[in-house]
């Protein structure tokens, strides 16, 4: 396994609709044909997998149908979007990139993006 640098923003604020987007960029000394991207969430010293996708270079990322993640790739950048977030989902979201093919295998783990989610205030009842 060879180490690889992965960069991601330090902080992102989710939208009022519970959507957060960030870019995960990896620096490899060459072009892989098969890349796996995994989003991990670290909260209270526990790490859980949020979503994962394997893609062929030049093709779109394909997450599972029930995944809360979507994404696109461009060169060595992956644009990730996480949907359906609520205040309780606030935490550190870590981007893990694996170059699966060709060998050798490269692994890179970002420092994480702190995603802050604020639940919207419920709309007050209106007399109109």
């Amino acid at each position: 396994c060879k180490a690889m640098h992965v960069a991601q923003p330090a902080v992102v604020l989710a939208s009022s609709r519970g959507i957060a987007s960030f870019v995960c960029e990896y620096a490899s000394p060459g072009k892989a044909t098969e890349v796996r991207v995994t989003v991990l969430r670290q909260a209270d010293s526990q790490v859980t997998e949020v979503c994962a996708a394997t893609y062929m270079m030049g093709n779109e990322l394909t997450f599972l149908d029930d995944s809360i993640c979507t994404g696109t790739s461009s060169g060595n950048q992956v644009n990730l979007t996480i949907q359906g977030l609520r205040a309780m989902d606030t935490g550190l979201y870590i981007c893990k990139v694996e170059l699966m093919y060709p060998p050798p295998y490269y692994l890179g783990i970002g420092n994480g993006t702190q995603i802050y989610v604020i639940d919207p205030e419920p709309c007050p009842d209106s007399d109109f």
Partner: antibody, heavy 119, light 107 residues
Framework: DVQLQESGPGLVKPSQSLSLTCSVT?????????WNWIRQFPGNKLEWMGY???????NYNPSLKNRISITRDTSKNQFFLKLNSVTTEDSATYYC????????????WGQGTAVSVSS | DIVMTQSQKFMSTSVGDRVSVTCKAS??????VAWYEQKLGQSPKALIF???YRYTGVPDRFTGSGSGTDFTLTISNVQSEDLAEYFC?????????FGGGTKLEIK
């Protein structure tokens, strides 16, 4: 440590074939990476000639048309360059190199072998 | 083919100075650019990959920058051992292509 070493004749006659060997130590050429031939002309211009990948696939520079062939002997951990119908324009220093992926940075280079095409 | 142009064939600098070597790609190559140093009588040595990432063991006075079509290798606090020729290379697409080289001369 990974080492690449080129070998072959330093003088080739025009219209003949140029054949070079790259011997690799410290890493199996079937385990990974892409294994290239690059040449440097007088004046220092560099040209990528082609590669053979860890799984035996090849890719060549279109500028060399059908003159080039890269093969390997996995039992000896060597790969080879054959360039047919050479002219004086093929006089150069020839390097074998290694890079990651399909398109990448050459992280290891041989010391190079000078080839002169002359009658 | 993608053409990599290093417009300055020679650059002269002094020990302790800062010098920037430039490279222009004929089309967008993202950050798929490498830089090499070649000292007289030696093979090229990889310095930078992915436009801005140093290889292990490369002194931090070497810095790569740029994306798209314009790239720069900056050497700060130039040392006498930096006397060499510097080449850029694109690896966005085949055939892989190199710049023509920039020779650094130390005054």
């Amino acid at each position: 440590d990974v080492q690449l070493q080129e070998s072959g004749p330093g003088l080739v006659k025009p219209s003949q074939s140029l054949s070079l060997t790259c011997s690799v130590t410290g890493y199996s050429i079937t385990s990974g990476y892409v294994w290239n031939w690059i040449r440097q002309f007088p004046g220092n211009k560099l040209e990528w000639m082609g590669y053979i990948s860890h799984d035996g696939n090849t890719n060549y520079n279109p500028s060399l048309k059908n003159r080039i062939s890269i093969t390997r002997d996995t039992s000896k951990n060597q790969f080879f360059l054959k360039l047919n119908s050479v002219t004086t324009e093929d006089s150069a220093t020839y390097y074998c190199t290694r890079n990651y992926g399909y398109g990448g940075t050459m992280d290891y280079w041989g010391q190079g072998t000078a080839v002169s095409v002359s009658s | 083919d993608i053409v990599m142009t290093q417009s300055q064939k020679f650059m002269s600098t002094s020990v302790g100075d800062r010098v920037s070597v430039t490279c222009k790609a004929s089309q967008n190559v993202g950050t798929y650019v490498a830089w090499y140093e070649q000292k007289l009588g030696q093979s090229p040595k990889a310095l930078i990959f992915s436009a801005s990432y140093r290889y292990t063991g490369v002194p931090d006075r070497f810095t790569g920058s740029g994306s798209g079509t314009d790239f720069t290798l900056t050497i700060s606090n130039v040392q006498s051992e930096d006397l060499a020729e510097y080449f850029c290379q694109q690896y966005d697409s085949y055939p892989l292509t190199f710049g023509g080289g920039t020779k650094l001369e130390i005054k």
